[in-house]
């Protein structure tokens, strides 16, 4: 039997990836981070 039409069974969540660099002071250089959906992961 052919399958009846249905959408895919999962929902795709679109998230924004934001790379940022922050100057933290004279002797400490910079922090480079990756923010995914509002959470810093690197």
């Amino acid at each position: 039997d052919a399958e009846f039409r249905h959408d895919s069974g999962y929902e795709v969540h679109h998230q924004k990836l934001v790379f940022f660099a922050e100057d933290v002071g004279s002797n400490k250089g910079a922090i480079i981070g990756l923010m995914v959906g509002g959470v810093v992961i690197a």
Partner: antibody
């Protein structure tokens, strides 16, 4: 509110063609994911699925009746039409239309039904 | 075709008591998208069918929480925790995974 209403002849003769109309209100068949199907129920018997049409004109038929059925839509009138050729007394039944909508946030089940229209096939 | 077999076909129940209806499909109704499209409809006397449960276990809006659905693969169950007089009618299981879409033969629930 969402309503569906079936209309058509109460009596048809054997070998004739039946034309049924389902008029929709409270929602539009042109909405992405929207679909309408037809189901029938002979007196005192179980339900039988006949056909379904989607907003994009994709159609599905019950293979056992496919040669006799045509489902179509008139988006401007918000109507779905089912024709069944070569009617026979065994086609005597109440015919229902029902709504079904695809989508990850949709029920994806027949959530609204019409009240049904009774068709008798007799000479 | 996927044959849906319900049992029992007749179900007399005392108000306030639980009730259970079984529905078995002749083959798996797991769709390729990962969902199982098993639905339950109730047809009250003289009325059109109405949706109770979709995708095995999800209650439709407005359906009392005494109704619950469960199962997987080919074996499904509708349970009513405490039957009320307004629950009388014919209950149909229905699969919409494969064409043709098919109903069970119906279970008639009546009050003792």
């Amino acid at each position: 509110q969402v309503t569906l209403k079936e209309s058509g002849p109460a009596l048809v003769k054997p070998t004739q063609t039946l034309t049924l109309t389902c008029t929709l209100s409270g929602f539009s068949l042109s909405t992405s994911g929207m679909g309408v199907g037809w189901i029938r129920q002979p007196p005192g018997k179980a339900l039988e699925w006949l056909a379904h049409i989607w907003w994009d004109d994709d159609k599905s038929y019950n293979p056992s009746l496919k040669s006799r059925l045509t489902i179509s839509k008139d988006t401007s009138k918000n109507q779905v039409v089912l024709t069944m050729t070569n009617m026979d007394p065994v086609d005597t039944a109440t015919y229902y239309c029902a709504r079904r909508q695809l989508g990850l946030r949709s029920i994806d089940a027949m959530d609204y039904w019409g009240q049904g229209t009774t068709v008798t096939v007799s000479s | 075709d996927v044959v849906m077999t319900q049992s029992p076909l007749s179900l007399p129940v005392t108000p306030g008591e639980p009730a259970s209806i079984s529905c078995r499909s002749s083959q798996s109704i797991l769709h390729s998208n990962g969902n199982t499209y098993l639905e339950w409809y109730l047809q009250k006397p003289g009325q059109s069918p109405q949706l109770l449960i979709y995708k095995v276990s999800n209650r439709f809006s407005g359906v009392p929480d005494r109704f619950s659905g469960s199962g997987s693969g080919t074996d499904f169950t509708l349970k009513i925790s405490r039957v009320e007089a307004e629950d009388v009618g014919v209950y149909y299981c229905f699969q919409s995974s494969r064409v043709p879409l098919t109903f069970g033969q119906g279970t008639k629930l009546e009050i003792k």
